[in-house]
Structures are given as structure tokens and as C-alpha cells.
């Protein structure tokens, strides 16, 4: 009976032990598995991501570009109405320049004297800019960049005096350090009467004869609006 | 987002000088004016001047001109006020402030400067 | 310099009411002012900016308006926060300037 006993211990033991190791195998193939699984959800987590980051960016794209379009259609249909009218009320900007609270811009890429440059503008039905307000400072020092730029800023007849007439005294300035000077050094002949735009933006006169670059200004007639689109 | 860190409290001497300093972070430090603005005990706000951290191109108030310099390291995306000739009446908080659209949208915490013998 | 002055000085009032200050320039600053709140042993926050532009995460029930040389800032309906003191600032030319302030208390 003993004996009986022993070998039915053994064979327990042996099942016992195939059944362990079969589990351990299991457990190892599901161990496996999950790992494949886990890295084949992240992959699928990461091409999802990638999917969805290149979506929010072509989105955005295409309302950058839907913007655009309605803003070239505005303009478009506005520069129709304008040369379907008789030109006297401008209600949106000329093709390539650029419209900040109700003027229009135009930033030269050469070199005028300040007469040139101020004959230029008027030719166009504009004025060298006249700054009236920080804001408009800092517009326009945005688009000419670090680069000596007339404004319709002068001092030709005696006193410093803007070219549309807004009031110089009481206005906005933004002079350099000890500007204006009428400075004489120069060896050109005569003072400086003439106003720029300097590298950082902020004021100084010099010889009107300098082949700087310059912006014109136009302003948008207050009384008429905005045609509606097509 | 967007933040304006100042120096802590500093006490001088009439005819010292002072160095306030404001750390940004969270924009461009190079795109945007600075001002500074100061607050002396249960007055007003008074503007200094401004700086330009691009160009370093400042603009000061006349009443300041000649006692106040207005520095920056972009490197670290610190500006930096220096006020000489400190009089009792220069006790004050003073406050860095970015430029905004026709205001100041964020300010420092302030640094409170105290003048006394 | 251009002079800002703000009335009236000081203005008590209840939660729930509606409360109006003015500013007014010493002369035409187009629409380029803004509006501070200011509350004691802290920095001024913007409120307003260009007379009637509400800057982000302030509360709908602050509003501004005008332009030229007198504008208004209007608080639709007093909130226990919103009691402090209000800075308008013309950022037209320099040197910018600020108005004295308006202290707004409980009645």
C-alpha cells in the first residue's frame, strides 16, 4: 500500500510539475502577447496623435486660407466698386498696401530724397506717413524694420511741421536722444530738416537730399462703407 | 504664460543709486516694449519711460531724464532700471509693465524701493 | 504733457449696482486709452484697452467707451471683488500719463 502510495505521489508530482510548467509557458505566451499588444496600442496611440496633430495643422492652414480669401474677395469686390464709381471716396486700400484703423499704407523698398519721396506719395493721392499715435509708431516701425525711412515730418520753412497739417506741437513724437539737432557737421551744406524713421524705430532729422526709403499714407473716407461681398 | 518677475525690496541712502530688475517669461522677450511705471506710498501711477529689448532703444520721461537708465539682457530675458541721485521722494513701488495694444497687459509684481538716511 | 483726470474721485456703492466713472484728456487722443483696476498692496491689471476693448479673462460685466477726449468705464453690476481702486491711461503720446484714480467702496 505503501508502494501505491509512492507512485501515486509521483504521479501527482509529475502533473503537477507539467501543469506548472504549461502555466509558465501560457503565462509567458500571454506575457508576449500582451507586450505585442501594448506596443502595437502605443504604435496605434502615436499614428492617432500624428493623425490628429496633422489635421489641427491643416485646419488651421485652411482657415489661414479662407481668411485670405474673403479678405482678397472683400478687396476685389471693393477695388471693382471703386473703379465702377468716380474715385472720390476711397472705402478700402489700393491693391499692395496695407490698411491699419482706417489708413492705408505703403512702404517703399528704395531710395528717394525727401522731396522725391514726398512728390511720390502725393502722385499716388497719399502723404508721406504723419505719425499721430504710439500705435501707429509701432505699425509702422513693424513693416520698415530696422531701416532709415522718411516720414512727412519737416522743418524747411522754420518751424517742425507735419504734411497733411496735423498739429506738430501738441502730437505724437519719438525722437532720439537729443534729437532733432540740425546738425551742420555733415559737410553737405546746411542743417538737417527733414525727419526719419532710424534703426530702432525712434525719430531723427537729417539732409533731405538722403536717398532714404519712405511710407505713404492715405486715409480711408470716414463716410463711406464697406461694399458688401459678392 | 505670460510673466513679469521683479527684484525684491531694496533700502538706500539719499544720493545712492538702485538697480530694479524683471524677469520675463512666457513670450518673445524681444518683441515687446517695456515700460516701467512707479507708485509712490498712497499716490498715483507715473511712467518712467521704455525699452526696447530688441534694439535697446529707450525713451525716457523728462522728469527722469539724466537719472534713469533702462538696460537689458536678452540673454536672459531681463530688463534692468537704474535710478541715481535717490531722494526721499523717489520711495516708491516700482512696477516693470509689457506693452500692449494702446496699454500696459501685464505687470510685474513691483519692488518696493525705499529712500532714507 | 497730456492731462488726465478722472471723476468722480471716490464712489460708494452696494453689490449689484451699477457704477460709471469718467476720464477725460486734456486733449483728442483718438481711442487710445485703457482702464486699471487696482487693489491695495497689489499691481495694476488690465481692464480695458483701446476705450472699448475688453482684454481676455475679464469679467463681460466691466465695459468701456468714448473717444477723443472723454471716455467711461461702466461696471454693470458691482461684485464683492470688484472693489478697488480704477486707474484710466492715455497711451497715445509720450510721456504716458495716468488719470488720479477713482476708489470704489462699500456703501
Known amino acids: 500500500q505503501n508502494a501505491q502510495l509512492q507512485r501515486e505521489l509521483r504521479g501527482l508530482r509529475e502533473t503537477l510539475s507539467n501543469f506548472t510548467a504549461s502555466t509558465e509557458a501560457q503565462v509567458k505566451g500571454l506575457s508576449t502577447q500582451g507586450g505585442n499588444v501594448g506596443r502595437k496600442m502605443k504604435s496605434l496611440e502615436s499614428q492617432l496623435e500624428k493623425q490628429q496633430k496633422d489635421l489641427s495643422e491643416d485646419h488651421s492652414s485652411l482657415l489661414l486660407h479662407v481668411k485670405q480669401f474673403v479678405s482678397d474677395l472683400r478687396s476685389l469686390s471693393c477695388q471693382m466698386a471703386a473703379l465702377q464709381g468716380n474715385g472720390s471716396e476711397r472705402a478700402c486700400c489700393p491693391v499692395n498696401w496695407v490698411e491699419h484703423e482706417r489708413s492705408c499704407y505703403w512702404f517703399s523698398r528704395s531710395g528717394k530724397a525727401w522731396a522725391d519721396a514726398d512728390n511720390y506719395c502725393r502722385l499716388e493721392d497719399a502723404h508721406l506717413v504723419v505719425v499721430t499715435s504710439w500705435e501707429e509708431q509701432k505699425f509702422v516701425q513693424h513693416h520698415i524694420g530696422p531701416v532709415n525711412t522718411w516720414m512727412g515730418l519737416h522743418d524747411q520753412n522754420g518751424p517742425w511741421k507735419w504734411v497733411d497739417g496735423t498739429d506738430y506741437e501738441t502730437g505724437f513724437k519719438n525722437w532720439r536722444p537729443e534729437q532733432p539737432d540740425d546738425w551742420y557737421g555733415h559737410g553737405l551744406g546746411g542743417g538737417e530738416d527733414c525727419a526719419h524713421f532710424t534703426d530702432d524705430g525712434r525719430w531723427n532729422d537729417d539732409v533731405c537730399q538722403r536717398p532714404y526709403r519712405w511710407v505713404c499714407e492715405t486715409e480711408l473716407d470716414k463716410a463711406s462703407q464697406e461694399p458688401p461681398l459678392l | 504664460q505670460v510673466q513679469l518677475v521683479q527684484s525684491g525690496a531694496e533700502v538706500k541712502k539719499p544720493g545712492a543709486s538702485v538697480k530694479v530688475s524683471c524677469k520675463a517669461s512666457g513670450y518673445t522677450f524681444t518683441d515687446y516694449y517695456l515700460h516701467w511705471v512707479r507708485q509712490a506710498p498712497g499716490q498715483g501711477l507715473e511712467w518712467m519711460g521704455w525699452i526696447h529689448p530688441n534694439s535697446g532703444g529707450t525713451n525716457y520721461a523728462q522728469k527722469f531724464q539724466g537719472r534713469v537708465t533702462m538696460t537689458r539682457d536678452t540673454s536672459i530675458s531681463t530688463a534692468y532700471m537704474g535710478l541715481s541721485s535717490l531722494r526721499s521722494d523717489d520711495t516708491a513701488v516700482y512696477y516693470c509693465a509689457r506693452d500692449g495694444t494702446s496699454s500696459f497687459d501685464y505687470w510685474g509684481q513691483g519692488t518696493l524701493v525705499t529712500v532714507s538716511s | 504733457d497730456i492731462q488726465m483726470t478722472q471723476s468722480p474721485s471716490s464712489v460708494s456703492a452696494s453689490v449689484g449696482d451699477r457704477v460709471t466713472i469718467t476720464c477725460r484728456a486734456s486733449?483728442?487722443?483718438?481711442?487710445?486709452l485703457a482702464w486699471y483696476q487696482q487693489k491695495p498692496g497689489k499691481a495694476p491689471k488690465l481692464l480695458i484697452y483701446?476705450?472699448?476693448s475688453l482684454q481676455s479673462g475679464v469679467p463681460s460685466r466691466f465695459s468701456g467707451s468714448g473717444s477723443g477726449t472723454d471716455f467711461t468705464l461702466t461696471i454693470s453690476s458691482l461684485q464683492p471683488e470688484d472693489f478697488a481702486i480704477y486707474y484710466c491711461q492715455q497711451a497715445n503720446s509720450f510721456p504716458f500719463t495716468f488719470g488720479p484714480g477713482t476708489k470704489v467702496d462699500i456703501k
Open positions: 483701446g476705450a472699448s
Open positions: 486733449q483728442g487722443i483718438s481711442r487710445w
